[in-house]
């Protein structure tokens, strides 16, 4: 750069700024007060994001893609900011954003790199398919690639089959595992490392259970301390497993302390839903209840799923009488 | 959008003198920083002067200073750069670039907001 006469030239200052997708974000920039402002932040040293010059904005060859999407902190800018507040980034926002600005002594560039994340709450689900069981963990949409890796009985394993597909702007990414015959425990855990976020799904077999017809049940879900924090919003889900389907009994909401039930031999014990003890019974069992019950506890940042298998045998006297 | 016009460049042997002129027909260059680079073939773009909208403030690259004058003619609507005792080291396309008030981005570097399509200035020895 080359020394001007009465110009001070204060070279590029870098900042690195994560944003996640759809929200807003700050685009910081300051600046040694002065006046006759001129603000300039430009998308790559070419798109014209925003500018600000004889006391207001000049936004009429802004590129169309900023569009009412960008302003400065007006009241601000006579303190030295120059910050940008930028609503709802994209995927397509991600880049070098440089910040000139000049007043009758100098002229200073910030450049910002924004790098724009997404992470969609994943889900771990469990799955039937003919006579294999498969536990699924699964994102809808994430950005950057994740790091998805499954233990079983708390030691990590290498098998990692990852189906990807990919969008315009994120990935869709299912990491299925064959669990048939095995009555382990299984976690996985997917992170973004750019917006430094984990889930953990985890998967407990419970022992199976042998019920005379019309007597009940009663089925443990209890959470995992190392995971739940009962401050976080978070769901229980009951379901039974019906030829392949799973068909919700009840479910539980934390955020409204509701419960709602579906299935009228189904209870829960309030008390204990207040303890985080998420156990229910089921009366008067009958022959069509045999099968899988699947408890899922579920947060943004993890699913526990409980697994239990009833058996429903007939009684003496409906024996006899056949 | 402001289409900027050099003209003025040809071809001149060392010592002698040009004056490129930068026009924008139908459009108020008072308004506008204007600035003025070149790029000599395998060469980086550079700058080297500029002159404010508002207070007609100039500035030079080192490398012209005392050589070259860079002036606006409102009634014109154009701005000149007199270059004089040129040197071979000159010859390059010089362009005129605009952008809001302030010698900001000029100063910077270069991320104008609009610019012409140059004009080639050929000194020989």
């Known amino acids: 750069i080359f020394p001007l006469a009465f110009f001070i030239y204060v070279p590029m200052n870098e900042q690195i700024v994560i944003g996640r997708l759809d929200e807003d974000i700050i685009l910081p920039s300051s600046f040694e007060r002065g006046s006759e402002v001129v603000i300039h932040w430009k998308y790559q040293d070419s798109y014209k994001v925003h500018s600000y010059y004889k006391g207001s904005d000049h936004l009429e060859s802004q590129d169309p893609r900023y569009a009412n999407r960008t302003s400065l902190f007006y009241n601000e800018i006579q303190n030295g900011n120059a910050s940008l507040f930028f609503r709802r980034v994209s995927l397509l926002d991600e880049g070098i954003y440089t910040c000139y600005v000049g007043t009758a002594i100098q002229v200073i560039t910030n450049k910002v790199v924004l790098k724009v994340g997404v992470f969609l709450t994943p889900v771990m689900k469990y799955e039937k398919r003919n006579t294999n069981s498969f536990l699924i963990c699964s994102v809808l949409s994430v950005y950057p690639r994740p790091i998805i890796t499954w233990k079983m009985d708390n030691t990590p394993i290498s098998e990692n089959n990852m189906e990807e597909t990919g969008s315009l702007d994120s990935f869709s990414i299912n990491s299925p595992l064959n669990i048939t015959g095995s009555n382990s425990s299984y976690e996985c855990t997917i992170e973004n490392s750019l917006l430094k976020q984990t889930w953990t799904g985890r998967w407990t077999m419970k022992d199976g259970l042998h019920k005379m017809q019309s007597e009940h049940v009663s089925l443990s879900c209890q959470p995992v301390n190392d995971y739940f924090s009962p401050n976080q919003d978070f769901k229980v889900t009951w379901s039974r497993m019906k030829s392949g389907t799973f068909s919700v009994l009840a479910y539980y909401l934390s955020s409204s302390q509701n419960t709602i039930i579906n299935e009228s031999r189904f209870s829960w014990n309030k008390e204990l839903i207040n303890q985080s003890d998420f156990s229910m019974n089921l009366m008067d069992l009958n022959l069509s209840d045999s099968g899988e019950y699947l408890c899922n506890i579920s947060s943004d940042e993890y699913t526990l799923l409980t697994i239990h298998t009833v058996h429903v045998e007939p009684s003496q006297e409906t024996a006899s009488h056949n | 959008d402001v289409q900027l016009q050099e003209s003025g460049g040809g071809l001149v042997q060392t010592g002698g003198s040009l004056r490129l002129s930068c026009a924008a027909p139908g459009f108020t260059l008072d308004d506008y920083a204007i600035g003025w680079f070149r790029q000599a073939p395998g060469k980086e773009r550079e700058r080297i002067s500029c002159?404010?909208?508002?207070?007609?403030?100039?500035y030079y690259a080192n490398s012209v200073k005392g050589r070259f004058t860079i002036s606006r003619d409102s009634a014109k609507n154009t701005v000149y750069l007199q270059m004089n005792s040129l040197k071979p080291e000159d010859t390059a396309v010089y362009y005129c670039?605009?952008?809001?008030?302030?010698?900001?981005?000029?100063?910077?570097?270069?991320?104008?907001?609009?610019w012409g399509k140059g004009t080639q200035v050929t000194v020989s020895s």
């Open positions: 670039a605009a952008e809001p008030i302030l010698c900001v981005l000029w100063s910077a570097g270069g991320a104008m907001d609009y």
């Open positions: 002159i404010t909208s508002s207070t007609n403030r100039t």
